[in-house]
C-alpha cells in the first residue's frame, strides 16, 4: 500500500530537498524562502530566483516555507496565568511560559494554564515541581492526600478513599464516641 | 453558593445553528474568566473555548474555530457560546465552568446542556 500524501506533500515530493513544484508549471522546481520570509512570488523559470519577502512585524516562518502569508505571532494568555520567556521574531513564534514556582497543565495539545507548584505542607516532597508537572507530596502521618494537598484525617468521611490511609484515626475516633455512650 | 444554569441545546441537523447561554450566580461573574468544554458520549472532557473577564479576548480549540463564538454580558451575568455550522461529531453535553484558579480541576461548573447534531 502507497501511504497517501496531499496535494502539496505530492507535488514538493517531486522536486529535490528545499526546492518546491511550481504551482503553474510542474517542469520548474523553485527555491524554497529561508526561514524568516515568506513566497512573494514563483520563480520564472529554471535556475531563476524565487521572489521571497521578509515577514512583517507581528509575523513569522520558523522553516523553510512556500507560504503565501507569514503566520500571526501567538499572544501569550494572561487569563492563563501565563508570560512572555521570549518575543516573537520573523523567524521564531513567541515563546510563552509560567513564572518561578509554576508549573504548566495543558488542558489541550496547545493550551496550557499556569498553576502554584504545592508546598507540601503536613507532608514532604516527594518529587519536586517539574515545568509541566506539580510537585508529587507524601503526607505525614494523620493526614491523606487531596487534589495534591496534605488533609487532615478528621476531615475523612467513611465513604471516600482516604478511609485506608486513616484508618488507624477512624477507629480512635469512632471508639472515643462509643466510649461515652451509655 | 455558586450556580451555573446552561440552556439552549437540543436536536439540530448539519450545517444548523444553536445559541447556548449560561446564567451565572453566586458571585461576582464580572470578575471571573468564564468557559466552555464538552463532553461527547464515551469520551473525556475537551476545552471548547474560554474568554476572559471584560470580554475582549477569546479562545477557541481548533476542531471549532471559525465555527464557534463566545460571548458575555456582565450586566447580565451571562456567558454564550454561539455554534454555526455544526457538525456530528459537535454532539455532546455542553457545560459552562468558572476558569479554575488553584489547580486543574473544575470546582464550579453546570450541569450541562445536550446538544444532538443528527440527520
Known amino acids: 500500500l502507497v501511504p497517501h500524501l496531499g496535494d502539496r506533500e505530492k507535488r514538493d515530493s517531486v522536486c529535490p530537498q528545499g526546492k518546491y513544484i511550481h504551482p503553474q508549471n510542474n517542469s520548474i522546481c523553485c527555491t524554497k524562502c529561508h526561514k524568516g520570509t515568506y513566497l512573494y512570488n514563483d520563480c520564472p523559470g529554471p535556475g531563476q530566483d524565487t521572489d521571497c519577502r521578509e515577514c512583517e512585524s507581528g509575523s513569522f516562518t520558523a522553516s523553510e516555507n512556500h507560504l503565501r502569508h507569514c503566520l500571526s505571532c501567538s499572544k501569550c494568555r494572561k487569563e492563563m496565568g501565563q508570560v512572555e520567556i521570549s518575543s516573537c521574531t520573523v523567524d521564531r513564534d513567541t515563546v510563552c511560559g509560567c513564572r518561578k514556582n509554576q508549573y504548566r497543565h495543558y488542558w489541550s495539545e496547545n493550551l496550557f494554564q499556569c498553576f502554584n507548584c504545592s508546598l507540601c505542607l503536613n507532608g514532604t516532597v516527594h518529587l519536586s515541581c517539574q515545568e509541566k508537572q506539580n510537585t508529587v507530596c507524601t503526607c505525614h502521618a494523620g493526614f491523606f492526600l487531596r487534589e495534591n494537598e496534605c488533609v487532615s484525617c478528621s476531615n475523612c468521611k467513611k465513604s471516600l478513599e482516604c478511609t485506608k490511609l486513616c484508618l488507624p484515626q477512624i477507629e480512635n475516633v469512632k471508639g472515643t464516641e462509643d466510649s461515652g455512650t451509655t | 453558593e455558586v450556580q451555573l444554569l446552561e440552556s439552549g441545546g437540543g436536536l439540530v441537523q448539519p450545517g444548523g445553528s444553536l445559541r447556548l447561554s449560561c446564567a451565572a450566580s453566586g458571585f461576582t461573574f464580572a470578575h471571573e474568566p468564564m468557559v466552555w468544554v464538552r463532553q461527547a458520549p464515551g469520551k473525556g472532557l475537551e476545552w471548547v473555548s474560554h474568554?476572559?473577564?471584560?470580554?475582549?479576548?477569546?479562545y477557541y480549540a481548533d476542531s471549532v474555530k471559525g465555527r464557534f463564538t463566545i460571548s458575555r454580558d456582565n450586566s447580565k451575568n451571562t456567558l454564550y457560546l454561539q455554534m454555526n455550522s455544526l457538525r456530528a461529531e459537535d454532539t455532546a453535553v455542553y457545560y459552562c465552568?468558572?476558569?479554575?484558579?488553584?489547580?486543574?480541576?473544575?470546582?464550579?461548573w453546570g450541569q450541562g446542556t445536550l446538544v444532538t447534531v443528527s440527520s
Open positions: 465552568a468558572i476558569l479554575p484558579k488553584r489547580g486543574p480541576r473544575f470546582d464550579y
Open positions: 474568554i476572559d473577564r471584560v470580554g475582549q479576548d477569546a
